[in-house]
């Protein structure tokens, strides 16, 4: 699985036209430095990224494997501008556990046994009434609504 030529989550923003040396962003840097916001803050940032990145990787893996015709149709509809509303409708009716399972579903047990095993274990523990630490970690890091919004904003395929 390549990490190359895959899109990270893209956000809408206006790029600064200012010269970097007069960029207002840089004027805040002295403040940040004086407050000592260095690697300890970066560690927290990385903690928050980890769960998101894993889901992004799963989605890119699904895309690159291109092993489900249904998913291909969804990509096409994304290009036509209808995918976002479809995802919204679908996710509104799904529990977080089912959504994670949906991401992994169909990837093939032989290719990705670890992720499939994780989801199956989550399902078993959920059925037992003992919700998993793993799921709690994910849900703690990503509130369901924020997660849905993040997914919708994610550029799922790079259509260059």
């Amino acid at each position: 699985r390549s990490l190359q030529d895959t899109e990270e989550k893209s956000r809408s923003f206006s790029a600064s036209q200012a010269d970097p040396l007069s960029d207002p962003d840089q004027m805040n840097e002295d403040k940040r430095h004086s407050q000592g916001t260095f690697t300890s803050d970066y560690s927290k940032y990385l903690d928050s990224r980890r769960a998101q990145d894993f889901v992004q990787w799963l989605m890119n893996t699904k895309r690159n494997r291109n092993n489900i015709a249904k998913r291909h149709d969804e990509f096409e509809r994304h290009a036509e501008g209808t995918f976002t509303s479809d995802v919204s409708s679908y996710l509104e009716g799904q529990a977080a556990k089912e959504f994670i399972a949906w991401l992994v579903k169909g990837r093939g047990r032989r290719d990705f046994p670890e992720e499939v095993a994780i989801v199956e274990e989550l399902g078993r523990r959920h059925a037992d009434g003992s919700f998993s630490d793993e799921m709690n970690t994910i849900l703690d890091n990503l509130a369901a609504r924020d997660f849905i919004n993040w997914l919708i904003q994610t550029k799922i395929t790079d259509r260059k």
């Epitope: 990490l3 990145d53 670890e114």
Partner: antibody, heavy 119, light 112 residues
Framework: QVQLVESGGGVVQPGRSLRLSCAAS????????MHWVRQAPVKGLEWVAF????????YYADSLKGRFTISRDNSKNTLYLQMNSLTAEDTAVYYC????????????WGQGTLVTVSS | DIVMTQSPDSLAVSLGERATINCKSS????????????LAWYQQKPRQPPKLLIY???IRESGVPDRFSGSGSGTDFTLTISSLQAEDVAVYYC????????FGQGTKLEIK
């Protein structure tokens, strides 16, 4: 294909400043976080700084003591590193590196630009 | 910061033979929520930048020959080249990306 080209290195006296640039092409620059990593003969590979795709997050190595500033211009597909109050310990090859979809993992590196701090 | 320590510092192996490089982290880089080890391996040839070989301890990056493999979990990791080729002469670095990124000191691989 992805290309990262650094420039701006050279010989500079202690206490002076230098600005490095990294011109990116072959990928959607505004969608990826970017890093500076340096390599000195004595200290090996050392992470320097990170900036997120939308500039909302910037982080630095503690060892820099606030002397360096990372920035980017997404309209120009260019990453920058402003280096102030340089010392001999800053002598190194400076690489810009593209972050993969996994945070703090570098899937593409530039060829590097040599910064030599010497009187 | 997490300290990465590689061994050996240098290694000489005959062409066609197996080369093994070890990497130890000062604390675990295993993320329990997805059972992934946030450990990468890079290859750096003379006068070139590092090149990503392996991430998540064992996943080969696209285009990397299958003679390269990674293994290990928690704090102990290994990069193995099953059959050394002349073009594999380089310095190899491990890097953890679980926290603020840090690199091992490098292992220089040469032909015996």
């Amino acid at each position: 294909q992805v290309q990262l080209v650094e420039s701006g290195g050279g010989v500079v006296q202690p206490g002076r400043s230098l600005r490095l640039s990294c011109a990116a092409s072959g990928f959607t620059f505004s969608s990826y976080g970017m890093h500076w990593v340096r390599q000195a003969p004595v200290k090996g590979l050392e992470w320097v700084a990170f900036i997120s795709n939308d500039k909302s997050n910037k982080y630095y190595a503690d060892s820099l003591k606030g002397r360096f500033t990372i920035s980017r211009d997404n309209s120009k597909n260019t990453l920058y590193l402003q280096m102030n109050s340089l010392t001999a310990e800053d002598t190194a090859v400076y690489y810009c590196a593209k972050e993969s979809i996994l945070a703090a993992l570098f899937d593409y590196w530039g060829q590097g630009t040599l910064v030599t701090v010497s009187s | 910061d997490i300290v990465m320590t590689q061994s050996p510092d240098s290694l000489a192996v005959s062409l066609g033979e197996r080369a093994t490089i070890n990497c130890k982290s000062s604390q675990s880089v295993l993320y329990s929520s997805n059972n992934k080890n946030y450990l990468a391996w890079y290859q750096q040839k003379p006068r070139q930048p590092p090149k990503l070989l392996i991430y998540w301890a064992s996943i080969r990056e696209s285009g990397v020959p299958d003679r390269f493999s990674g293994s290990g979990s928690g704090t102990d990791f290994t990069l193995t080249i099953s059959s050394l080729q002349a073009e594999d002469v380089a310095v190899y670095y491990c890097q953890q990306f679980y926290s603020v990124p840090t690199f091992g000191q490098g292992t220089k691989l040469e032909i015996k």
